[in-house]
Interface confidence: medium
């Protein structure tokens, strides 16, 4: 039961990291109160959102002014990768802590008080007590 929910949590974390990477690769849209989606910009002349990709062919279209450049790749990927790695480390830490705690709690029922202070690979019990 617990293992299943942890697996689900890990899957969500990986998915979140992947989405963060995708968003950062897509580049940054110029700020403003625009109703336009990422990679498009408002055309005052045409009164609608236009795809920024068309600015390569027609760079002097009015809406091209609102098309932002994507930041340089190393900086763009640094934070999602770092954040994902830290999150993964945190979840793995929680997972291993939980497994040790479960194992020690099970052993607690069957061991003598002398063994509780000293070992069998369960320092957590001694620390708690």
């Amino acid at each position: 039961m617990a293992r299943g929910s942890l697996r689900r949590l890990l899957r969500l974390l990986v998915l979140g990291l992947w989405l963060a990477l995708l968003r950062s690769v897509a580049g940054e849209q110029a700020p403003g109160t625009a109703p336009c989606s990422r990679g498009s910009s408002w055309s005052a002349d045409l009164d609608k959102c236009m795809d920024c990709a068309s600015c390569r062919a027609r760079p002097h279209s009015d809406f091209c002014l609102g098309c932002a450049a994507a930041p340089p790749a190393p900086f763009r990927l640094l934070w999602p990768i770092l954040g994902g790695a830290l999150s993964l480390t945190f979840v793995l830490g929680l997972l291993s802590g939980f497994l040790v705690w479960r194992r020690c709690r099970r052993r607690e029922k069957f061991t003598t008080p002398i063994e509780e202070t000293g070992g069998e690979g369960c320092p957590a019990v001694a620390l708690i007590q």
Partner: antibody
């Protein structure tokens, strides 16, 4: 904090050239279009030129077209205005400004201004 | 974009500065208003017709009137520090960014 610091103004003879610089800090430079606006002594504001965040799209007022070139160095967070074939009527305080260009074309951050005097 | 050359009013009173668009509808593109004190760079007091940047007092307000095809900047409770030049600005097809001629506000 968000800041635009200008440099490069001065006295130049008619027909001469000058390059203005505008160093940006405190914001993601590549995400914003940038613009140059000038103000002749005792006159109003006049838009001169604008450039998209990528630098791929440039725009000019008719009065400077073919003489002025706007550019940007995104890794250096710097905006430039190369002014050639300068005339007496180009004498003005030149301001660089950050443009909120997606959905409305307004300037929300301005440089301190730099005086360009064209005189023989 | 046409603005009155100058306006004047006493402290504590309300003043309205107009900005009339000669071609095209005033409502088709957003209007911004800038304040410029002598010897200083302009600062935004109104953007997107009616929006006020943080730090700008609520004595400043912007509006659009389609019947007169003009935008207006209203300053209530006038203070001596409001004395400055005010410029409206909008988008214009072809010239991209266009400014009004400016209005000198004198607080008597």
């Amino acid at each position: 904090q968000v800041q635009l610091v200008q440099s490069g103004g001065g006295l130049v003879k008619p027909g001469g050239s000058l390059r203005l610089s505008c160093a940006a800090s405190g914001f993601t430079f590549t995400s914003y279009a940038m613009s140059w606006v000038r103000q002749a002594p005792g006159k109003g504001l006049e838009w001169v030129s604008a450039i998209s965040g990528s630098g791929g799209s440039t725009y000019y007022a008719d009065s400077v077209k073919g003489r002025f070139t706007i550019s940007r160095d995104n890794p250096k967070n710097t905006l430039y205005l190369q002014m050639n074939s300068l005339r007496a009527e180009d004498t003005a305080v030149y301001y660089c400004a950050r443009v909120r260009a997606n959905y409305y074309y307004g300037m929300d951050v301005w440089g301190q201004g730099t005086l360009v005097t064209v005189s023989s | 974009l046409t603005q009155p050359h100058s306006v004047s009013e006493s402290p504590g009173k309300t003043v309205t500065i107009s900005c009339t668009r000669s071609s095209g509808s005033i409502a088709s593109n957003y209007v911004q208003w800038y304040q410029q004190r002598p010897g200083s760079a302009p600062t935004t007091v109104i953007y997107e017709d009616t929006q006020r940047p943080s730090g700008v007092p609520d004595r400043f307000s912007g509006s659009i009137d389609t019947s007169s095809n003009s935008a207006s900047l209203r300053i209530s409770g006038l203070k001596p520090e409001d004395e400055a030049d005010y410029y409206c600005q909008s988008y214009a097809s072809g010239s991209l960014i266009v400014f009004g001629g400016g209005t000198k506000l004198t607080v008597l």
